[in-house]
Structures are given as structure tokens and as C-alpha cells.
Interface confidence: low
């Protein structure tokens, strides 16, 4: 449906508040280093222009595409060359190449200062003084640090952020009210960002077909009572929404997401019985709720899969006629019967089925050839089941911190070339799978664990892509989206790695460690652990445990000392010497 003015169309659909918020997010995700005030100025200019187009769609420039309008605006930034270097070359290009160029320069790990949370009273004063600026600043700071954050969902986070301040800044104990809410938003926000990053990587690196396959499997698990045609329609619409958001088309994305939520709620009878509560909520909450809704109950009378996909004489005929539709139906039928499987496992099974049909439908006796295809699924199903069982046992034995340390050692030995901060961040997140998923009953463990691991390993992949240092990481990240986790699991110690030279400075600590939060202190210790493994990749678990126990005792002792700095200096030297001896460094 063509509109004379796209910008007027989106302004009218979204309303001024959401329009301004989404343009701010889009600009901050593109120009991640620009000061807040510069972005606000650009957004206000775009908004004023949009209003002139709403008044008269035939006005000058109102017929231009959003990419043209936004790109032209971004290219007016005076310090583009100094701040962004070669990204300024994007401005010499025409659309759509210019937008593609901006997208390629999005930085998953921008060199920005860590966000420090001010005192509660300071935050509440800022909130009351200028609520609008305070909330815009939140959008800006999150968007620039997470350039692929799902924009319509960020609006939902901002709404909750505002609600937290509105409630807590008038509470008797502001801090007790506010801080847990902010912690929850921070943790949920990081998880949401990482999940969306995987969706964008899936679309951008592996294509629409890969994303659609993921969506068919996930939606079929969630809506097992829905017809295949219904699931296919939802998949098509969902793919459009995520393609737009991942492509920087945030206004279109938010608009289409709202339409999809509306469609789902209008047709919930033919989709799922679990949608009723979600559909009574306002738009942002509704969309979020639908995205997180629990799986509907499976229909009671589902026939065996073998009849249509193995025993039927028409398997090869149906496959040849429309390969993707037939494979889509296989995936739909398998997924709706298996909410206990991870999406990536379901996709591995579908891939195995596809490979078998490709081979067998060209054979002399196709049926004979593919008759045992379901037997090939057994090892694929057992591999993640066994892995999760072993790792949950280890987690229950060690607790989260020590489980993270075990993974730190494991992954540093696999890919020691990866930077220490990345190894710490990724291994800490991998370790969180324990508290997140091991508490679940068997039927929910695999979808929780393996699909979460896919999200975390994608973080490793996108961070590594920025500065590639390991062929093994590149191989596991690029060969197959659904086999990333098995690929990393299969890696052994990298025998080609030349150990890092010992540097005492890396293991020198100061009294400032005593004032850190427990989490920050853990990160310091885990950073030291990674460095130890990089120096001594052949160190045994027992050796590493002994050194880490000594290190923990050293920190505890010096933090209790009267003259902390002297203690850290003197005892630190002894610790380094003892560690070198223990590890043979």
C-alpha cells in the first residue's frame, strides 16, 4: 500500500511520542559516539519535518524514503570524519548502499564508558526536574551500547523504567524500592539485547530461510494447535518485522509489530488458548507478553509423524514439488510434538531429514533408502540431553561462581587467542545457564539450556568477528548456525597455542579491589584465572584450584589489613612467586 509520504504515514500510525523515541533509537544505534544533545537536536528536526508532511503530504521532500531522510540527516553531523573515521565515507554513497554502509559500521562493543548508576536521590531529582529528557537519555544510552536492541521492545523497557521512578521516587525508602527494579531491568535488558542480536545475526549471516526455519520451529512449539497455514502466515509476518528492525527500519518495524500483535489477538481462537491475558494489555505490554507467552497444550490426537514423512509413497513427490513447504511442514509437525526439544535440535533434525531426502529421492529405491531416517535422529537427540545432564550435575556440585570458573578454564583452553575480557564475559554468561535452566524439570531443560547457549555463543561470534583472532572460532561461528554449540563443545585443547609470556603486572592487585561489589571482585579473579590458563594451558584443574584458593585468601587477608596497600604489595609478590612455583611458570 503506497503512501505519498512514508514519513507522514509512520508519524500518523505511531504517534508523536513513539515516533520521536524510535528516531532517537535509530540515530543512537547508527552514530554511537555522538553526544546526547546532538541526537536530540537531529530528532527534533526530523519530527518538525514529519509534521509538515502530515499537514501536506505533497510538500517538498515528503515523498523521500525514510532511509534517504534519515541518512541525509545523519550526514549533516559536523564531526563525522573525526569521530567515526571511514564511516564518513558512507555519506558519499546513494541509497540503499548508504544505509547498508551505516549498518556495517554498527559496533557491538563500542568504546564507551561503563554506565555508572548515580545515587538514588540524584536520579530522582533528575527524573522530577525533566522527566522527558531523563527518559530520552535512557533510550539513548541503551541504544548506543546495544546497536541491535529490538526497538519496539526498548520502548517497553522505557515504559517500565518510567514506572519504576514514578513509583519509587515517592516511596519512604526510595533505594529499597528502586534498586531491585533497576537491577531487574538491567539484567532483562542485557538478555533481550543478546536474544535480538542472534535474530539479526541469523538474518544477516545465514539469510531469511534460516530465520524462517527458526521461527517455524519456535512458533509451532508455542502454538501447537494452530494450522500450518496459520503458523506460516505468522512466520512471514514475524520475519518482516525482524528484517526491518535488524536493517535499521525501526518505524516500519514497530508499526508492523503492532499490526502482528493485533492480528494475533483478533485470531487467537485459531492460534492459542494462552493469549487471552496478553491480548487484554496495552500495546507495548501486549507485544512483549505475546513474545514470551507459554506454550499451548499439544492437541491430544496427533498421529504418528512416520505416516506422512516416512511411510507414505508420496514423500519424494511431495518433497520435489515444493521442497521448502514440505520441509516446513515436517518442522512444524515435529516441533508441535516436541516442546521438550531445543529449537536448534529441531532444526538439526530437519536438516538431517532434508539431507536424507536429497540423497534418497535420487536413489533406485527411495523408500528403502529413507525408511530408517528417524533412527538417525536418536544420537542427535541424546547428545544435548547428555551434555545438559552432565553440566547440571557439575553446576549443582559447584554453584554458579565455581561452575563459571570451570567453563572459563574449558573455553580458554579451547580458544586461548580470544581476548581475556571476551572470554570472561562469555564464560560468565555460559555459566548462568545453570541457575537459569537446571532448576527446570527434564522436559523444559533442553529448550531452556541449548537455546540460551545459542544466544551466548552468538555474543562470542559477533565480538570475535570485530577482531578475528582464532580460526577455530571463525569456523564454529560461520559453518552452521544450528551446529555452533556442538562445534564449540567438540573443540579440544588448542595444541598449536604458544603460551603467553608471564607478566607480573597482570597479577598485581591493589586495595581498590576491596571496595568493589561482589560481582566486580569475581570478574577480577576470573580475569586472573583466564590469564593463568593463557600462561599455562596445560595446568591441571587441581593446580589452578590451588592457585585460585590462595588468591582468594590473599584478597580476603589484605582487605582486612590496616595498611591494605602495603599488604597487597608485599603479600602479592609472595603470591606471584608461590603461583609460579606451583604452576612451573
Amino acid at each position: 500500500d503506497a503512501h505519498k509520504s512514508e514519513v507522514a504515514h509512520r508519524f500518523k500510525d505511531l504517534g508523536e511520542e513513539n515516533f520521536k523515541a524510535l528516531v532517537l533509537i535509530a540515530f543512537a544505534q547508527y552514530l554511537q559516539q555522538c553526544p546526547f544533545e546532538d541526537h536530540v537536536k537531529l530528532v527534533n528536526e526530523v519530527t518538525e519535518f514529519a509534521k509538515t508532511c502530515v499537514a501536506d503530504e505533497s510538500a517538498e521532500n515528503c515523498d523521500k524514503s525514510l532511509h534517504t531522510l534519515f541518512g541525509d540527516k545523519l550526514c549533516t553531523v559536523a564531526t563525522l570524519r573525526e569521530t567515526y573515521g571511514e564511516m564518513a565515507d558512507c555519506c558519499a554513497k546513494q541509497e540503499p548502499e548508504r544505509n547498508e554502509c551505516f549498518l556495517q559500521h554498527k559496533d557491538d562493543n563500542p568504546n564507551l564508558p561503563r554506565l555508572v548508576r548515580p545515587e538514588v536521590d540524584v536520579m530522582c531529582t533528575a527524573f522530577h526536574d525533566n522527566e522527558e529528557t531523563f527518559l530520552k537519555k535512557y533510550l539513548y544510552e541503551i541504544a548506543r551500547r546495544h546497536p541491535y536492541f529490538y526497538a519496539p521492545e526498548l520502548l517497553f523497557f522505557a515504559k517500565r523504567y518510567k514506572a519504576a521512578f514514578t513509583e519509587c521516587c515517592q516511596a519512604a525508602d526510595k533505594a529499597a524500592c528502586l534498586l531491585p527494579k533497576l537491577d531487574e531491568l538491567r539484567d532483562e535488558g542485557k538478555a533481550s539485547s543478546a536474544k535480538q542480536r542472534l535474530k539479526c545475526a541469523s538474518l544477516q549471516k545465514f539469510g531469511e530461510r534460516a530465520f524462517k526455519a527458526w521461527a517455524v520451529a519456535r512458533l509451532s512449539q508455542r502454538f501447537p494447535k494452530a494450522e500450518f497455514a496459520e503458523v506460516s502466515k505468522l512466520v512471514t509476518d514475524l520475519t518482516k518485522v525482524h528484517t526491518e528492525c535488524c536493517h535499521g527500519d525501526l518505524l516500519e518495524c514497530a508499526d508492523d509489530r503492532a499490526d502482528l500483535a493485533k492480528y494475533i489477538c483478533e485470531n487467537q481462537d485459531s492460534i492459542s488458548s494462552k493469549l487471552k491475558e496478553c491480548c487484554e494489555k496495552p500495546l507495548l505490554e501486549k507485544s512483549h507478553c505475546i513474545a514470551e507467552v507459554e506454550n499451548d497444550e499439544m492437541p491430544a490426537d496427533l498421529p504418528s509423524l512416520a505416516a506422512d514423512f516416512v511411510e507414505s509413497k508420496d514423500v519424494c513427490k511431495n518433497y520435489a514439488e515444493a521442497k521448502d513447504v514440505f520441509l516446513g511442514m515436517f518442522l512444524y509437525e515435529y516441533a508441535r510434538r516436541h516442546p521438550d526439544y531445543s529449537v536448534v535440535l529441531l532444526l538439526r533434525l530437519a536438516k538431517t531429514y532434508e539431507t536424507t531426502l536429497e540423497k534418497c529421492c535420487a536413489a533406485a529405491d527411495p523408500h528403502e533408502c529413507y525408511a530408517k531416517v528417524f533412527d538417525e535422529f536418536k544420537p542427535l537427540v541424546e547428545e544435548p540431553q547428555n551434555l545438559i545432564k552432565q553440566n547440571c550435575e557439575l553446576f549443582e556440585q559447584l554453584g554458579e561462581y565455581k561452575f563459571q570458573n570451570a567453563l572459563l578454564v574449558r573455553y580458554t583452553k579451547k580458544v586461548p587467542q580470544v581476548s581475556t575480557p571476551t572470554l570472561v564475559e562469555v564464560s560468565r554468561n555460559l555459566g548462568k545457564v545453570g541457575s537459569k535452566c537446571c532448576k527446570h524439570p527434564e522436559a523444559k531443560r533442553m529448550p531452556c539450556a541449548e537455546d540460551y547457549l545459542s544466544v551466548v555463543l552468538n555474543q562470542l561470534c559477533v565480538l570475535h568477528e570485530k577482531t578475528p583472532v582464532s580460526d577455530r572460532v571463525t569456523k564454529c561461528c560461520t559453518e552452521s548456525l544450528v551446529n555452533r554449540r556442538p562445534c564449540f563443545s567438540a573443540l579440544e585443547v588448542d595444541e598449536t597455542y604458544v603460551p603467553k609470556e608471564f607478566n607480573a603486572e597482570t597479577f598485581t592487585f591493589h586495595a581498590d579491589i576491596c571496595t568493589l561489589s561482589e560481582k566486580e571482585r569475581q570478574i577480577k579473579k576470573q580475569t586472573a584465572l583466564v590469564e593463568l590458563v593463557k600462561h599455562k594451558p596445560k595446568a591441571t584443574k587441581e593446580q589452578l584450584k590451588a592457585v585460585m584458593d590462595d588468591f582468594a585468601a590473599f584478597v580476603e587477608k589484605c582487605c582486612k589489613a590496616d595498611d591494605k596497600e602495603t599488604c597487597f604489595a608485599e603479600e602479592g609478590k609472595k603470591l606471584v612467586a608461590a603461583s609460579q612455583a606451583a604452576l612451573g611458570l
Partner: nanobody
Framework: QVQLQESGGGLVQPGGSLRLTCTAS????????MSWVRQPPGKGLEWVSA????????NYADSVKGRFTISRDNTKKMLYLEMNSLKPEDTAVYHC???????SSQGTQVTVSS
């Protein structure tokens, strides 16, 4: 079970007309945009025309614009393609599909030849 059954194809002379019909069953037809796609001999699938669920939007490939008209009747669960001024290059198997998906139906053969 989703089923799409095309009919109305046949042999016609250049300049002639045909009306294709697609009968749908097994899904909520009135909720879905529908398309016609075709597969000329020895070639891949090509999109011909699409219509939104409520018939408010209709789109056509440049090669058929002004000659073909897409329409639907939601009460009867039927999709139509009116084809006028047919040319030899319109020869193909025509399929109706949900949205702009791949063809999973048998299709109906249209041959334009003198």
C-alpha cells in the same frame, strides 16, 4: 489439511483469454493474502500477482500489468485470475499460494500457442 486446487487452464491462441480459479480449504482463507505464481517450462517459479486478505491491495508483476486481474471471494474461499491478451511467454503452470509462499499445489497448465 491445507488444500489449494487450481482449475481453468488450457490451450489458447495469442490474444485470447482465460480465467483461472483456485479453491481453498483447510485454513482461514479470509485471513490470508494470496498470490498467483507460475513456472514456465524449464524455468523457476515467478510471482505473477498478489491480493490482500480484504482485497484492498492488489499487486502485479510488470510483465502482466494491464492484462491480468486478480480477485477473490472470501465467502466461497475462491481466488481468481482473469487473463486477457495472452502471449506465448505466459505459457506456464500456474499455482495459487498463501501469502507469497512457494508453490505446493498441482497447478493448472496454461499454453498460449497458435
Amino acid at each position: 489439511q491445507v488444500q489449494l486446487q487450481e482449475s481453468g487452464g488450457g490451450l489458447v491462441q495469442p490474444g485470447g483469454s482465460l480465467r483461472l480459479t483456485c479453491t481453498a480449504s483447510g485454513f482461514a482463507f479470509s485471513n490470508f493474502g494470496m498470490s498467483w505464481v507460475r513456472q514456465p517450462p524449464g524455468k523457476g517459479l515467478e510471482w505473477v500477482s498478489a491480493i490482500s486478505a480484504d482485497s484492498s491491495t492488489k499487486n502485479y508483476a510488470d510483465s502482466v500489468k494491464g492484462r491480468f486481474t486478480i480477485s477473490r471471494d472470501n465467502t466461497k474461499k475462491m481466488l481468481y485470475l482473469e487473463m486477457n491478451s495472452l502471449k506465448p511467454e505466459d505459457t506456464a503452470v500456474y499455482h495459487c499460494v498463501i501469502g507469497r509462499g512457494s508453490a505446493s499445489s498441482q497447478g493448472t497448465q496454461v499454453t498460449v500457442s497458435s
